[in-house]
């Protein structure tokens, strides 16, 4: 029951996390710029991974996609890649985890297969979450280091620089959404990995002598054997592994010089 709950909760948490990663990737407000010392034109500028926007005090808003890849910083391309990889891995992880859920029966799928699928999806969620956190952190680092503060082309007739509108770059809402979503996906992945341990069937393998005490004859076969105790999970002498030994039902006794005293 606890395993099912852990697995189910891990799936839901990861689902929310991946939805958040997708939302963050699509959002426009990765960085915001307050043009705070321009009393004439009160405009608010914000940028996403795919386009940049301007909002005026009148409420007018315009967004345009980036014209060219060449004018974009390499770091932005890296962030795009990380977020997309995170989404793809997360989506595959969700697909795998649906079939791995203990509460869903698909054909005659064994618990061991479900355990493997749960572990796979858990690892995918962890990597997906890490990709999202890394992508958002790289972008945040770009903002902190003021990567693009000196990009304006400003010239005067005297050949000197003219100082333009001061811009203050701040973290946009998408960064916080991305961090939280990445964290949730990571936590969901860890929960799936924990659930995997509970799903794996517990089998005890022994190396011992296979014997039965029917009369005076004893079948003895050297090599790897398992013990049949007559109780527990192996009452039907089911073969656990083949180490050159056979179960009692399979053993044939042939007359030998030791049979007769």
């Amino acid at each position: 029951m606890a395993v099912t709950a852990c697995q189910g909760l891990g799936f839901v948490v990861s689902l929310i996390g991946i939805a958040g990663i997708i939302a963050a990737t699509c959002m426009d407000q990765w960085s915001t710029q307050d043009l705070y010392n321009n009393p004439v034109t009160a405009v608010f500028n914000y940028q996403g991974l795919w386009r940049s926007c301007v909002r005026e005090s009148s409420g007018f808003t315009e967004c345009r996609g980036y014209f060219t890849l060449l004018g974009l910083p390499a770091m932005l391309q890296a962030v795009r890649a990380l977020m997309i990889v995170g989404i793809v891995l997360g989506a595959i992880g969700l697909l795998v985890s649906i079939f791995a859920l203990k509460c869903i029966r698909i054909g005659s799928m064994e618990d061991s297969a479900k355990a493997n699928m749960t572990l796979t999806s858990g690892i995918m969620f962890i990597v997906s979450g890490l990709c999202a956190i890394a992508g958002v952190s790289v972008f945040a680092n770009m903002l902190v280091t003021n990567f693009w503060m000196s990009t304006a082309n400003m010239y005067t007739g005297m050949g000197g620089m003219v100082q333009t509108v001061q811009t203050r770059y701040t973290f946009g809402a998408a960064l916080f959404v991305g961090w939280v979503a990445g964290g949730l996906t990571l936590i969901g992945g860890v929960m799936m990995c924990i659930a995997c341990r509970g799903l794996a069937p517990e089998e005890t393998n022994y190396k011992a002598v296979s014997y039965h005490a029917s009369g005076h004859s004893v079948a003895y076969k050297p090599g790897g054997f398992k013990a049949s105790t007559g109780f527990g999970s192996n009452t039907k002498n089911k073969k656990i592994y083949d180490g050159g030994a056979r179960t009692e039902d399979e053993v044939q006794s042939y007359p030998s010089k030791h049979d007769y005293v």
């Epitope: 710029q33 034109t41 405009v43 500028n45 940028q47 386009r51 940049s52 926007c53 301007v54 005026e56 005090s57 009148s58 007018f60 315009e62 967004c63 345009r64 996609g65 980036y66 014209f67 004018g71 974009l72 910083p73 932005l76 693009w148 990009t151 304006a152 082309n153 400003m154 333009t164 509108v165 811009t167």
Partner: nanobody, 120 residues
């Protein structure tokens, strides 16, 4: 290659009028923000008037009611009509285009400036 070329400056008496023009090439005159900025001798930059893509028009308090900003999209030209000029309006007037959308790096383009002298 982006170019902003101002014209229309000159010597004018107090109370007179002038019309400054800013012909743009390589940049859309209906950019996110088009503005006139001036620099009086020995002083810093002062925003005069601004016109946004959305049509918002703003003026500095010192020029309200006397200056009018406008643009002609067909000619790709920005204008500043200056009436009732005063001695304190003497400055080099710069045309400024600021682009935020469609570019990751906000762009700010400036003209070479045109001198306006108000003197009797």
């Amino acid at each position: 290659q982006v170019q902003l070329v101002e014209s229309g400056g000159g010597l004018v008496q107090p109370g007179g009028s002038l019309r400054l023009s800013c012909a743009a090439s390589g940049v859309d005159i209906s950019s996110d923000v088009m503005a006139w900025v001036r620099q009086a001798p020995g002083k810093g930059l002062e925003w005069v008037s601004g016109l946004t893509r959305g049509g918002s028009i703003n003026y500095a308090d010192s020029v309200k009611g006397r200056f009018t900003i406008s643009r002609d999209n067909s000619k790709n030209t920005l204008y500043l009509q200056m009436n009732s000029l005063r001695a304190e309006d003497t400055a080099v007037y710069y045309c400024n285009a600021e682009i935020y959308t469609g570019t990751f790096y906000p762009r700010s383009y400036w003209g070479q400036g045109t001198l306006v002298t108000v003197s009797s």
